[in-house]
């Protein structure tokens, strides 16, 4: 669920390669897909399946495609526009402690309790004690990365496409 | 777990700016690839996304709001603000900010504030 | 922009019975669709992802479904606690949009 965003996830672009389309800025923002020059006057296309940028921007460059680890399976590919999507493999889910790999499902519940959750690529069953029903699971941690940013960033007007 | 919080005058008279700020807590609006949501619910109606800021300050808009529509974003105090100028009645609203995960893998809006009733009455 | 239809805007249930709740896309978004879930006077919370089938912490009762214009969210087995407003959020275009909400009423 988080977004891991840091300097090395930047994907340097060399000058406009010939396959590179450019456009002009819309009120100093380039649209999904693409990322901003460094004079601010051109939009510069993401290289598919390499780097992507999701919203309306002036990032200096698109953002690198995440590869899907071993154990992980590929749900949708990179796009200029989208991020990989990775999962973990049937039987193993991505635990709180340890985010960056997916661990193995227990197969049943400890003598006292009962089994309410299956398994699936984001917690591991789902176990509550019989008289109590008191859960025990795992869940997905919201892990961020800080990217340092000078403070207060003046106010400024929406900005959009014609 | 990072959380969201609304603040602002609650009643607004027509054609002046409402104006509200979003605090964060339990994380840094700093992260990179979160854009920072500002939504509005009408009375008993549905959901209307306003905009995003980033935090470097580009924003972005809906077009049926962007003539009035202001965003900003102060990383010092780890909040940002929405201003929304002339309004009429017709801006009565419930008024969210919210976390819009810019990863590209998962895009939705989690966390939201609790959200804050604006009301634009003489 | 991008119109989300729901269907039904209101749906009357029981505990244990199966709800299935339709969206609509006026155009194709791929599995770029969101649902949440809204009680009355608190804020929407996010429920699923369709395009990974993600929801953390979500029961598993619930479940998303289809790609292109046509989606489904499906309660298997509807709770006490799971009445309420569920909404679809196209994420696929901006601006982005929302549907105009399903309510699930006690019968």
């Known amino acids: 669920e988080s977004a891991l965003i840091t300097q090395q996830d930047l994907a340097p672009q060399q000058r406009a390669a010939p396959q590179q389309k450019r456009s002009s800025p819309s009120e100093g923002l380039c649209p999904p897909g693409h990322h901003i020059s460094e004079d601010g006057r051109d939009c510069i296309s993401c290289k598919y399946g390499q780097d992507y940028s999701t919203h309306w921007n002036d990032l200096l460059f698109c953002l690198r495609c995440t590869r899907c680890d071993s154990g992980e399976v590929e749900l949708s590919p990179c796009t200029t526009t989208r991020n990989t999507v990775c999962q973990c493999e049937e039987g193993t889910f991505r635990e709180e402690d340890s985010p960056e790999m997916c661990r193995k499902c227990r197969t049943g519940c400890p003598r006292g309790m009962v089994k309410v959750g299956d398994c699936t690529p984001w917690s591991d069953i789902e176990c509550v004690h019989k008289e109590s029903g008191t859960k025990h699971s795992g869940e997905v941690p919201a892990v961020e990365e800080t990217v340092t940013s000078s403070p207060g960033t003046p106010a400024s007007p929406c900005s959009l496409s014609g | 777990q990072v959380q969201l919080q609304e603040s602002g005058p609650g009643l607004v008279k027509p054609s002046q700016t409402l104006s509200l700020t979003c605090s964060v807590s339990?994380?840094?609006?700093?992260?990179?690839?979160?854009?920072w949501s500002w939504i509005r619910q009408h009375p008993g109606k549905g959901l209307e996304w306003i905009g995003y800021i980033y935090y470097s300050g580009s924003t972005y808009c809906n077009p049926s709001l962007k003539s009035r529509v202001t965003i900003s974003v102060d990383t010092s105090k780890n909040q940002f603000s929405l201003k929304l100028s002339s309004v009429t009645a017709a801006d009565t609203a419930v008024y969210y900010c919210?976390?819009?995960?810019?990863?590209?893998?998962?895009?939705?809006?989690?966390?939201w504030g609790q959200g804050i009733l604006v009301t634009v009455s003489s | 922009d991008i119109q989300m239809t729901q269907s039904p805007s209101s749906v009357s249930a029981s505990v244990g019975d199966r709800v299935t709740i339709t969206c609509r896309a006026s155009q194709g978004i791929s599995s770029w669709l969101a649902w949440y879930q809204q009680k009355p006077g608190k804020a929407p919370k996010f429920l699923i992802f369709v395009a990974s089938s993600f929801q953390s912490g979500v029961p598993s009762r619930f479940s998303g479904s289809g790609s292109g214009t046509d989606f489904t969210l499906t309660i298997s087995s509807l709770q006490p606690e799971d009445f309420a407003t569920y909404y679809c959020q196209q994420a696929n275009s901006f601006p982005r949009t929302f549907g105009q909400g399903t309510k699930v009423e006690i019968k």
């Open positions: 919210a976390r819009d995960n810019g990863s590209g893998s998962y895009d939705w809006f989690d966390p």
């Open positions: 339990g994380g840094s609006i700093s992260s990179g690839g979160y854009y």
